[in-house]
């Protein structure tokens, strides 16, 4: 990695999380340089010999790429000149977790920054009214989580109430034997109330809300990654 730049440039990374079996992004930005051919981007992973990815002279150079990343990485080439060195990662695996370094070298100088990449599985929950039950109940389902999350219920009317005694949560291993389907049933629900099902592990937190009235059922779900930024 040659050193021709006289000073350091600012390189910024963001701690992020990858959802296994999907595309992931390792985020990295730097001070832009209009001379594309003078920009070198190197991604490294702690504990791995060879590079995760290299982009230089306006194109990818995978001559030193480690085999575990072959065919799985790409930079956003059209965004490099505006200072985007982020890396797209195909088919995220648990083993992709770790500390990555984004090295940048431009005509203005050089710099680097580390990022912590977490991997796991997280998905939106869906809450439905379970009419099969003897008394009215709610069923909260989320198809893919890893590591095993905690599940908690809350209610707008009974704020602060502990629903662990009137709920039942199960974890069913999915076909790839890593992720699990989360199912939680809340019993003895009352109408004209809003219930929330919260699923959380060390990577993500998801919440599903359901409002049950005489005339309608309203649902809302949200997912947030933890410790990002």
């Amino acid at each position: 990695f040659g050193i021709s730049g006289k000073h350091f440039i600012t390189v910024t990374t963001f701690t992020s999380a990858g959802n296994i079996g999907e595309d992931g992004t390792l985020s990295c930005t730097f001070e832009p340089d209009i001379k594309l051919n003078g920009i070198v981007i190197q991604w490294l992973k702690e504990g791995i010999k060879g590079l995760v990815h290299e982009f230089k002279e306006g194109k990818d150079d995978l001559s030193q790429q480690h085999e575990m990343f072959r065919g799985r990485t790409a930079v956003f080439a059209d965004q490099v000149v505006v200072g985007n060195a982020s890396l797209r990662l195909k088919n995220v695996q648990l083993t992709d977790a770790g500390t990555y370094t984004c090295y940048i070298h431009t005509s203005k100088g050089k710099g680097n920054a580390n990022l912590e990449y977490k991997t796991g599985a997280f998905s939106m929950p869906e809450i439905n009214v379970d009419y099969n039950a003897s008394s009215e109940s709610l069923r909260c389902e989320a198809p893919r989580w890893f590591p095993q999350p905690t599940v908690a219920w809350a209610s707008q009317v009974d704020q602060g109430a502990n629903f662990s005694e009137v709920s039942n949560t199960s974890f069913e291993l999915n076909s790839e034997n890593v992720t699990m389907k989360v199912v939680s049933v809340l019993y003895n629900v009352t109408i004209n109330n809003t219930y929330s099902c919260m699923i959380e592990n060390d990577i993500a937190k998801a919440t599903g809300d359901i409002k049950v009235t005489d005339s309608e059922v309203k649902r809302r779900s949200q997912l947030e990654l933890l410790n990002s930024g």
């Epitope: 296994i20 079996g21 999907e22 595309d23 990815h53 194109k59 990818d60 150079d61 995978l62 001559s63 790429q65 072959r70 065919g71 799985r72 990485t73 790409a74 080439a77 797209r88 195909k90 088919n91 893919r144 999915n174 076909s175 790839e176 992720t179």
Partner: antibody
Framework: EVQLVQSGAEVKKPGASVKVSCKAS????????IGWVRQAPGQGLEWIGD????????NYNEKFKGRVTITRDTSTSTAYLELSSLRSEDTAVYYC??????????????WGQGTLVTVSS | DIQMTQSPSSLSASVGDRVTITCKAS??????VAWYQQKPGKAPKLLIY???TLQPGVPSRFSGSGSGRDYTLTISSLQPEDFATYYC?????????FGQGTKVEIK
């Protein structure tokens, strides 16, 4: 515009070898994987393998290992598929295709016109 | 290696019909499933990739969905030009694999 132009039809005898070429234009040849797929008459599509022209890295369908070689010539932006020890069941249309996503191996988004290889004694 | 089992192998439908084709992966989970349309004597054409992303220029009547091991191609309202053979492809694994194909014929 991305274009993949393949070599012409071939007739070969059992036991022989065939080499099909695929000339790419309209994009940076060394930056995208190129895959090979075949289709026997009246049959479905069968993935053979692929190559990253920027480094020469290859992946092969286990079924063809030992009989197939995928190479490239970066000076002419051409990829090649060579299949040896030909048998009658290798009679098929052979397609080359560019994989989307640059160095990321994506789905095949641009295809050559196909090359018919006939194996007959 | 991941195999893709596609069904049905053929179907008859009329213009305006809603058509659904499914592919089941032999193992694992990933979203790397693409769908192709092929007409006789022509090269395949990419319709959908990454389970549900429509390739530019492909009509919106084509849609893809799925998760886990089960993936679906839906044509919401079959048009005369849609009569063709459709293939799924899994491209998440190191070794790619096509489904066996589904021929959509005129009823």
């Amino acid at each position: 515009e991305v274009q993949l132009v393949q070599s012409g039809a071939e007739v070969k005898k059992p036991g022989a070898s065939v080499k099909v070429s695929c000339k790419a234009s309209g994009y940076t040849f060394t930056s995208y994987w190129i895959g090979w797929v075949r289709q026997a008459p009246g049959q479905g599509l069968e993935w053979i393998g692929d190559i990253y022209p920027g480094g020469g890295y290859t992946n092969y369908n286990e079924k063809f290992k030992g009989r197939v070689t995928i190479t490239r010539d970066t000076s002419t932006s051409t990829a090649y598929l060579e299949l040896s020890s030909l048998r009658s069941e290798d009679t098929a249309v052979y397609y080359c295709a560019r994989l989307a996503g640059s160095s990321y191996r994506g789905a095949m988004d641009s295809w050559g016109q196909g090359t018919l290889v006939t194996v007959s004694s | 290696d991941i195999q893709m089992t596609q069904s049905p192998s053929s179907l008859s439908a009329s213009v305006g019909d809603r058509v659904t084709i499914t592919c089941k992966a032999s193992q694992g989970f990933n979203k790397y499933v693409a769908w192709y349309q092929q007409k006789p004597g022509k090269a395949p054409k990419l319709l959908i990739y990454y389970t549900s992303t429509l390739q530019p220029g492909v009509p919106s009547r084509f849609s893809g969905s799925g998760s886990g091991r089960d993936y679906t191609l839906t044509i919401s309202s079959l048009q005369p030009e849609d009569f063709a053979t459709y293939y799924c492809l899994q491209y998440g694994d190191l070794l790619y694999a096509f489904g066996q194909g589904t021929k959509v014929e005129i009823k």
